[in-house]
Interface confidence: low
C-alpha cells in the first residue's frame, strides 16, 4: 500500500509480489517523485484499493498497457 | 530549486551538438527535454528517470537522432547529431511532477541556430 | 502521436472579462493528465494546471482547467493585464506510447 509522505507525494516503499488479474484494475498512476525511494507503479482496484507494482516487471507493463487501450475503447 | 541549460551554440547543417542541464539540488525528479523554434509552439523531445535506473523515453520522431543521458547526480544532457535548420530552436529542460505527466520547473532554454 | 488541437490561435478580451481556450486530444488521455501552461515572451513556460483541473501551487484561482476524455478547457476569469501571454495545452499519453503532446498555442490579448 503506499505511503503519502505529505500532501503532493505519494510513495511506494514495497511492491506487491503477487500478479494482479486486469479485470481487476481500474487505472494506474506512475510515481516518478525523487522524494520516493523506488519509481512505482499505483494500480487502483475496481474496489478502489490501491497497490504498489515494480514497473520493470513485464504483468506490469502489460496491465499498464492493457488500460492504455481499454481507454481507447469507447464505452457503449 | 532552479534548472540551467548550457550549449547552445551557431552550428552548421550535419553538426552535431551537446546540451548540458544542470539541477540546483541533487534531488531532482524526472528531466526532460522541450524545445520551440523561433515564434512556434512547443514540442517534446525526450525524458530521462533521476532514480537509479535512469529510464529513457524519447518522441517518435527523435529516436536516433537525439540521446539524453544522465552524467552526474545534479546534469543531464541531451546530445544531438547531425543536425539541420529545422532543429534550430531554443532547447528547454523541465522536471516532472510527481507523476510523470507535467511539467513543474523549467530551466529558461538555451538557443541553438543550425545555419551554414 | 498524441495530436493537441487548440483554439482559438488568438483571442482578445478586456480587463475583468472571461477568455476560454480549448484544446482536444486526438485520442483519450488517460487518467486526464492534462496539464496547461502558460508563457510570455522571451521567458519559459509556467506550469498552470495539471491533471485537467488541478491548481498548480502559486496560480492565482482566476485560472480553472476543466474536461475529460478528448476535450478540455481552460477558462481565465477576471482577466487581469498580466494574463497576457501564450497558453498551451499538454497531453501526456500514457505507457504504451509515451509521448507528451502539446497543443499549437493560444495568445491572449488584453485589452
Known amino acids: 500500500q503506499p505511503d503519502a509522505i505529505n500532501a503532493a507525494v505519494t510513495c511506494c516503499y514495497n511492491f506487491t509480489n503477487r500478479k494482479i488479474s486486469v479485470q481487476r484494475l481500474a487505472s494506474y498512476r506512475r510515481i516518478t517523485s525523487s522524494k520516493c525511494p523506488k519509481e512505482a507503479v499505483i494500480f487502483k482496484t475496481i474496489v478502489a484499493k490501491e497497490i504498489c507494482a515494480d514497473p520493470k516487471q513485464k504483468w506490469v507493463q502489460d496491465s499498464m498497457d492493457h488500460l492504455d487501450k481499454q481507454t481507447q475503447t469507447p464505452k457503449t | 530549486q532552479s534548472l540551467e541549460e548550457s550549449g547552445g551554440d551557431l552550428v552548421k547543417p550535419g553538426a552535431s551538438l551537446t546540451l548540458t542541464c544542470t539541477a540546483s539540488?541533487?534531488?531532482?525528479?524526472?528531466i526532460c527535454w522541450v524545445r520551440q523554434a523561433p515564434g512556434k509552439g512547443l514540442e517534446w523531445i525526450a525524458c530521462?528517470?533521476?532514480?537509479?535506473?535512469?529510464?529513457t523515453y524519447y518522441a517518435s520522431w527523435a529516436k536516433g537522432r537525439f540521446t539524453v543521458s544522465k552524467t552526474s547526480s545534479t546534469t543531464v544532457t541531451l546530445q544531438m547529431t547531425s543536425l539541420t535548420a529545422a532543429d534550430t530552436a531554443t532547447y528547454f529542460c523541465?522536471?516532472?511532477?510527481?507523476?510523470?505527466?507535467?511539467?513543474?520547473?523549467w530551466g529558461p532554454g538555451t538557443l541553438v541556430t543550425v545555419s551554414s | 502521436a498524441l495530436v493537441m488541437t487548440q483554439t482559438p490561435s488568438s483571442v482578445s478580451a478586456a480587463v475583468g472579462g472571461t477568455v476560454t481556450i480549448n484544446c482536444q486530444a486526438s485520442q483519450s488521455v488517460y487518467n486526464n493528465n492534462m496539464a496547461w501552461y502558460q508563457q510570455k515572451p522571451g521567458q519559459p513556460p509556467k506550469l498552470l494546471i495539471y491533471?485537467?483541473?488541478s491548481l498548480a501551487s502559486g496560480v492565482p484561482s482566476h485560472f480553472r482547467g476543466s474536461g475529460s476524455g478528448t476535450q478540455f478547457t481552460l477558462t481565465i476569469s477576471d482577466l487581469e493585464s498580466d494574463d497576457a501571454a501564450t497558453y498551451y495545452c499538454?497531453?501526456?499519453?500514457?505507457?504504451?506510447?509515451?509521448?507528451?503532446?502539446f497543443g499549437g498555442g493560444t495568445e491572449v490579448v488584453v485589452k
Open positions: 530521462i528517470g533521476a532514480g537509479s535506473s535512469g529510464s
Open positions: 523541465a522536471r516532472t511532477g510527481t507523476e510523470f505527466t507535467y511539467y513543474s520547473l
Open positions: 491533471t485537467a483541473s
Open positions: 499538454a497531453g501526456y499519453k500514457s505507457y504504451s506510447n509515451d509521448e507528451y503532446g
Open positions: 539540488e541533487l534531488d531532482f525528479y524526472w
